[in-house]
Amino acid sequence: SGVFQLQLQEFINERGVLASGRPCEPGCRTFFRVCLKHFQAVVSPGPCTFGTVSTPVLGTNSFAVRDDSSGGGRNPLQLPFNFTWPGTFSLIIEAWHAPGDDLRPEALPPDALISKIAIQGSLAVGQNWLLDEQTSTLTRLRYSYRVICSDNYYGDNCSRLCKKRNDHFGHYVCQPDGNLSCLPGWTGEYCQQPICLSGCHEQNGYCSKPAECLCRPGWQGRLCNECIPHNGCRHGTCSTPWQCTCDEGWGGLFCDQDLNYCTHHSPCKNGATCSNSGQRSYTCTCRPGYTGVDCELELSECDSNPCRNGGSCKDQEDGYHCLCPPGYYGLHCEHSTLSCADSPCFNGGSCRERNQGANYACECPPNFTGSNCEKKVDRCTSNPCANGGQCLNRGPSRMCRCRPGFTGTYCELHVSDCARNPCAHGGTCHDLENGLMCTCPAGFSGRRCEVRTSIDACASSPCFNRATCYTDLSTDTFVCNCPYGFVGSRCEFPVGLP
C-alpha cells in the first residue's frame, strides 16, 4: 500500500490556445486530469489501472501551481494504491479548458483538450522527487513525482505491513525494510521476550520484564545462582536445592548435631587439652596444678602434701615451702636428726632403730602413712576409678563417683543405654562408649528416630529430559530443575525457543 504523488509546478500556454489551435475565450481556464496505470511500452488509452485524479481549475493560460496540501491534498496530487508497487508505471497528464463550472468529462466538448502528455518507466519507492518537463508545440508542463509507502507499510515495494507496538505481543519499532527492531530490553521473534538482569542464571532464573531476575523454586540471590538449602538446615550448605551438606564438625539431617564441641565451645580452661568424644561430649586433660571436669579448679601446690615428717606446707608465689618440725630438715623435711628416743612416730606408730641407733623407721597403724606416720592415707592417689570416675575419700575407705553411662565400685561397668529402648519408630539401638546411636528406618530421623521425614520422592525418577530431582522434605514432594529448553513440573515439555 502506498501513494503515487504528482506535484504540478508550472504550466505554460502563452497563446492561450487549445490542442486544435483554436484560442480559448476569454482565456484557457486550465484544469488537469491524471491517469496512472501499469507499464506499457507504448502508452495507450484505456483503464487507469493504478488510479485517476482530477484537479479544479488551477489558472488561466500560463501559471505556476502553488503547493497546497490543505485542500484535500490538491498539490501534490495523491494517487493511492492498495497493492505491491511493481516498480514500473505509465502516466498520462491531460490539460483541459473549462468553459463552465462543470468539469465532468461528459460535460465538456471533446475539443476542450489543451494538451496531453504520456510517460512511462521505472520508479523505485523513495522520498526523493523526480523532476520532469514535457514540451509540445504550444505548451510546456513542469512537474515532479514520486512513490512513497502509506503509513505502516515498508520495503522496496510497500508490501510489508509493520506497526510499531509496545505491549505483550511485541515491543518494537519498524525498520525501513519492514523488519522489527526490538526496543531496549526485549528480544525474540516478536520482541516479546524480556532480556533478564545481566548474569541472571539461564536455567534457575527468568523474568517477565527487562532487567529483572525472578528465581525458580529452590534458588535465591540477585542472580538466582544460590541454592536454597533444606528447610531447617543449621550448620550446612547446598550445591543443589534442598540439600544440607554439613559444615566440618556438624552432623545430622539438619547439621544441627555438634560433633566438634571442643572447637565450637572451647570448654577446657587453663590451657588444658580438649578431646572430642562424641556428640556434645568431650574430655579435658588438665595441666599440672589444675583439676575439675573443665580443669577450672586451681590446685594448691600444698594439696599434694609434699612435706614429710609432719612438716607444715606454706603456699608461695613460686611454689611452696616446708616448715619442718624439730629434728627434721631438707626441702621436704625428709632428713631426720632424731632417733627412737625422741618418739618420732605419730598416730600410734611404733619406732624401730636402724643403723645402730643412727636412724629409725616407723611402723604405722592402718589409715596412716609417711616416714613418721604423720599422714592420713589417701586412698585415691592410685586413681582406682575407671572411665573418668571421680575418687572420693570416705574415712578409712574410698568411693568412686561415676560418669553417666558407667557403674560398679570402680566405675568399671558400662551401663547399657539401650536397655530402656530409647529408639522410636522401630529404630535399632547401638551402645557407644559415650552414649548410644539409633539407626532409623526409612521415613524417620533424629537422634532417637523421633522426626518423621519424607521418603525420597525422587526415588521413582519422576523428572524427564535429564532434569535434576530434589526431594523437598518439608512438603513430601519432589522438585525438578529443568535443563535449558524444557519446562513443566516434571520438565516434560520442550520450550519453542526463538
Partner: antibody, heavy 121, light 107 residues
Framework: EVQLVESGGGLVQPANSLKLSCAVS??????????WGWIRQSPKKGLEWIGD???????YYNPSLKSRVTISVDTAKNTFYLQMDSLRSEDTATYYC?????????????WGQGVLVTVSS | DYRLTQSPASLSASLGETVNIECSGQ??????ASWYQQKPGKSPQLVIY???KRPSGIPSRFSGSNSGDQASLKINSLQSEDVATYYC?????????FGGGTKLELK
C-alpha cells in the same frame, strides 16, 4: 489439531468465587508463540476480554476486572485457569478460553466451546 | 478507556452482494485489527488478522483494510454460510478491546 476445553461453570452465589479450567490438547501450553486468554460474552456487554497468561506465568488483565481476577497456568497439566472473586449478577456470561497468537498480532485463532456461568442467589 | 464502534449494528444483504462492515476507534490505523465471525450458539472464529490477512481455511471473499481511524471488513459475493455476527478487535496497550458487533442477515 489444538483443542481448548473449558470446565467449571454453573450456578454461583453472589459474592462467591469461581474457578474455571481450560485444558489444552494437541499442542503444548509451553509454546513461546502464544498467550492463553479468557474472554466472556453477555447479551448486555458483548465480547469482553478478561486477561491472558504466558507459559512463563506473566499475566495481563483488563483494568476493569483486575482486582477480582487471577489467571494461572499448570504446564504439567497443560491447563490454564481463571479465578474470579466477589461475583455479581453482571458477571453472568458465557466464558471462553482462547489461544492468542503472536504471529497473528494477538489474534485469537483457537477458541474453546464456552462455558456458561450464572451468578444468582 | 479505548472504544471500538461498529457500524452498522445490523444489516440485511442479498446472496452474491458485497457487504462492508466498519469499525472505528481513535488512531485505529496504528493498531492491528482482527475480525471474528460468530454464528448462533457457536464460539467466535478468526476471519481476518493484522488488518488484512486471512487465516488458512478462510475464503478469499473476506478481506480487510485499516487506516486512519477506521478498519473495514469486506465480504464479496455474500454466501448463505456468511450469515453471522461480526466483531472487530484490537489491542490498546496490554488490553484486548472488542467492537459491539454487526449482525448480518439475508434479505
Amino acid at each position: 489439531e489444538v483443542q481448548l476445553v473449558e470446565s467449571g461453570g454453573g450456578l454461583v452465589q453472589p459474592a462467591n468465587s469461581l474457578k474455571l479450567s481450560c485444558a489444552v490438547s494437541g499442542g503444548s501450553i509451553s509454546s513461546s508463540s502464544y498467550y492463553w486468554g479468557w474472554i466472556r460474552q453477555s447479551p448486555k456487554k458483548g465480547l469482553e476480554w478478561i486477561g491472558d497468561i504466558y507459559y512463563t506465568g506473566s499475566t495481563y488483565y483488563n483494568p476493569s476486572l483486575k482486582s477480582r481476577v487471577t489467571i494461572s497456568v499448570d504446564t504439567a497439566k497443560n491447563t490454564f485457569y481463571l479465578q474470579m472473586d466477589s461475583l455479581r449478577s453482571e458477571d453472568t456470561a458465557t466464558y471462553y478460553c482462547a489461544r492468542q497468537a503472536l504471529a497473528m498480532g494477538g489474534g485469537s485463532d483457537k477458541w474453546g466451546q464456552g462455558v456458561l456461568v450464572t451468578v444468582s442467589s | 478507556d479505548y472504544r471500538l464502534t461498529q457500524s452498522p449494528a445490523s444489516l440485511s444483504a442479498s446472496l452474491g452482494e458485497t457487504v462492508n462492515i466498519e469499525c472505528s476507534g481513535q488512531r485505529l490505523g496504528d493498531k492491528y485489527a482482527s475480525w471474528y465471525q460468530q454464528k448462533p450458539g457457536k464460539s467466535p472464529q478468526l476471519v481476518i488478522y493484522e488488518d488484512s490477512k486471512r487465516p488458512s481455511g478462510i475464503p478469499s471473499r473476506f478481506s480487510g483494510s485499516n487506516s486512519g481511524d477506521q478498519a473495514s471488513l469486506k465480504i464479496n459475493s455474500l454466501q448463505s454460510e456468511d450469515v453471522a455476527t461480526y466483531y472487530c478487535q484490537a489491542w490498546d496497550r496490554d488490553t484486548g478491546v472488542f467492537g459491539g458487533g454487526t449482525k448480518l442477515e439475508l434479505k
